[in-house]
Interface confidence: low
């Protein structure tokens, strides 16, 4: 049996005045909940969204038929106001109301924190009709409650476009502390203060925080969440975590490593990618950055030569990319190369030194005493020269390149000849008569082609002219020679 409930309810007129022929009844008494005489279960809606709680209100129904009495105000019956339970437990709560049978199509909706609960929640409304009233019980169940189910739940009933609202039922889901902020890994300067933050929430509150450093609690007494730990400074790496305690137990944050910034480790794997006569392209693998970003690197170059003074050339470069082209080197020379990088703390040691060599260079001087003369009988131009005095770095002479340019009546044609290193003379066929032939010679090594000699010009007359006078490289400072025949 369902017992009668009498409670104080503040009248809340739904309608502007009494209906014709109605009698007014005691507004303060609620209708009793009738004995169960049958029910019509109807599935309702549900779960969870946040918002604001509503305060309950009542409706004062009136009756139409002549001689009938004024009905009492409608209000949800008081129910449990606060339910506390642990996470993952099941909960069921309800609200009930007795509605005069004159009202049709009464529906009850559930609201959480001011938002209607729609969807496949376990909300069931049961109707227990009697002669004059129908008792309506709306129940709401949640299986395996979570923190997100915390909130204020109310029932709403709509009658004649007016709302009746139940008192709120506060659901408090308790569990282990839940971290909202955990300490973060940091890289700090030695002996410099820094802060770590830890925050956790219940319910239940309060949540107390213990800090742990390298497996030892930092604070002997707990601090109420949130907690800021000021570490005055470290001289070596430390691992920090925080423990959050409440009446349900303990939750431990992730452990975070606080690293001490240090000079970087030296770069490794210095590699030669390309060598030319005067440059070397290197790369390296950066060492450990010492928990502080690299700023720049220094490439150190020493010439490996017993006769060199052992001085070190230093080339500064950005830390990225890990590559540098060393320039202004001597040809055919051996070098020892090391790399060092720096961060805000300082320079790393130098990487292991590696040996590298530049390749042969091109000759730096042109062949000497170039002479040119016409051998008319063979229709050839004879060219003679002296081997240049090349430096060792230029490498071994492999030959000569002869450039001869033929100019006649606005037409110019350049031809190139290659001759072996053992030669100091060459013959070239006359290409054009009645023309000027300009000859230049360059020495060639594996390192490349050296500079060309100063041009020597010879005029090639029309057929039948004879002149054996040579044209030759002028003495330094003289104008280009031209032999006119």
């Amino acid at each position: 049996a369902i017992t009668e409930a009498r409670e104080e309810a503040k009248p809340y007129p739904l309608f502007p005045g009494p209906l014709p022929g109605s009698l007014q009844t005691d507004h303060t008494s609620l209708l009793s909940l009738p004995h169960t005489s049958g029910y019509q279960p109807a599935l309702m809606f549900s779960p969870t969204q946040p918002g604001r709680p509503y305060t309950g209100n009542v409706a004062i129904p009136r009756v139409t038929s002549a001689g009938s009495k004024l009905l009492p105000p409608l209000a949800f019956k008081h129910t449990v106001g606060h339910i506390i339970l642990s996470e993952h437990k099941d909960v069921k709560f309800n609200c009930s109301i007795s509605v005069p049978n004159i009202y049709q199509d009464t529906t009850i909706s559930w609201w959480k924190d001011g938002k209607e609960l729609l969807g496949a929640h376990h909300a069931i409304t049961q109707f227990y009709p009697d002669d004059e009233v129908t008792a309506i019980i709306a129940s709401f169940s949640i299986t395996s409650v979570q923190r997100s189910d915390n909130g204020s739940y109310i029932c709403k009933m709509k009658i004649n476009n007016e709302e009746i609202v139940s008192d709120p039922i506060y659901i408090e889901v308790q569990g282990l502390p839940h971290f909202t902020k955990q300490p973060e890994s940091m890289n700090v300067t030695r002996n410099t203060a820094f802060n770590l933050t830890c925050q956790a929430v219940g319910p239940p509150e309060p949540v107390n925080i213990f800090w742990v450093q390298n497996s030892s609690r930092v604070n002997e007494q707990p601090e109420k969440s949130p907690s800021v730990l000021t570490v005055p400074g470290l001289t070596e790496m430390a691992v920090f975590s925080c423990e959050a305690h409440n009446d349900k137990g303990l939750t431990v944050s992730k452990g975070v490593q606080i690293n001490i910034k240090a000079i970087p480790s030296p770069p490794t794997e210095v590699s030669i990618h390309n060598s030319t006569a005067h440059s070397i392209l290197i790369s390296w693998v950066p060492g450990f950055d010492g928990y502080s970003p690299f700023r720049n690197c220094s490439v150190q170059v020493k010439e490996v030569d017993p006769l060199s003074n052992g001085s070190v050339m230093i080339f500064n470069t950005s830390a990225s990319p890990h590559m540098y082209q060393i320039k202004q080197l001597q040809a055919l020379a051996n070098y020892s190369i090391g790399v060092s990088c720096m961060n805000e703390i300082g320079w790393s040691a130098v990487s292991p030194w590696i040996l590298a060599s530049t390749t042969e260079g091109a000759p730096s001087v042109a062949p000497l005493n170039v002479t040119v003369f016409l051998n008319e009988s063979r229709d050839n131009v004879d060219i003679r020269w002296m081997k240049p005095l090349t430096k060792r770095q230029a490498g071994e002479l492999v030959g000569y390149r002869i450039s001869h340019v033929w100019q006649s009546a606005g037409i110019s044609k350049e031809l190139l000849e290659e001759v072996g290193q053992n030669n100091s003379r060459a013959q070239i066929s006359v290409q054009v008569h009645n023309a000027t032939c300009t000859v230049r010679i360059a020495a060639v090594t594996k390192g490349g082609v050296g500079p060309f000699s100063d041009p020597v010009k010879i005029f090639i007359p029309a057929h039948g002219w004879v002149d054996h006078a040579p044209s030759s490289t002028p003495a330094p400072g003289n104008a280009d020679p031209v032999l006119i025949i």
């Epitope: 213990f210 390298n214 497996s215 030892s216 609690r217 930092v218 002997e220 691992v239 975590s241 423990e243 305690h245 137990g249 303990l250 431990v252 992730k254 452990g255 490593q257």
Partner: antibody, heavy 117, light 108 residues
Amino acid sequence: QVQLVQSGAEVKKPGASVKVSCKTSGNTQIRYYMYWVRQAPGQGLEWMGILNPNQDQTTYAQKFQGRVTMTRDTSTSTVYMELSSLRSEDTAVYYCATTYRYYMDVWGQGTTVTVSS
Amino acid sequence: EIVLTQSPGTLSLSPGERATLSCRASQSVRSNYLAWYQQKPGQAPRLLIYGASSRATGIPDRFSGSGSGTDFTLTISRLEPEDFAVYYCQQYGSSPRTFGQGTKVEIK
């Protein structure tokens, strides 16, 4: 609540290595520092080192440095302590222990390691 | 490393008597991070006191810890038959963690 279950007794020859396991049950997330302590027959407790399972940070007592290695296998919630170059004086009961909550200390049942030729 | 010296080495007492065990550190123990353990033959140690004076869960209130800095004391106000065992102090304020050599409380 956390329980620590250690591997069974071992008999080893001098110079050999021993690897003792310590499996966490109850709370399979090993989130706490794990300590290893040993006790030679009739002697006191001797701290060997700590393993922080979250970050594999280890701290070893100077006496065992270079001979002891503490590791973990998260997939099986097991911590290991390996001691190499065993000598007769390493004969002892080896315990793993952890602080599960700030007010609680949990110990394994101990593993007897006997070093004998 | 911090050396812990326990005294006396052996304490012979009767049930109902008061036991006072001392633990002295060679240097100050950080934040009084000192624990007391009880060990019975064939068993693992059992934590009694942490933080020099806080009783661990489930430890009877006849056990109490006191002291700070370098001098610490474990007191058993009235010895029960099950209290006869070896007691160790341990500092956990710095690495390496170190134990005292132990005090044996035996029945007189």
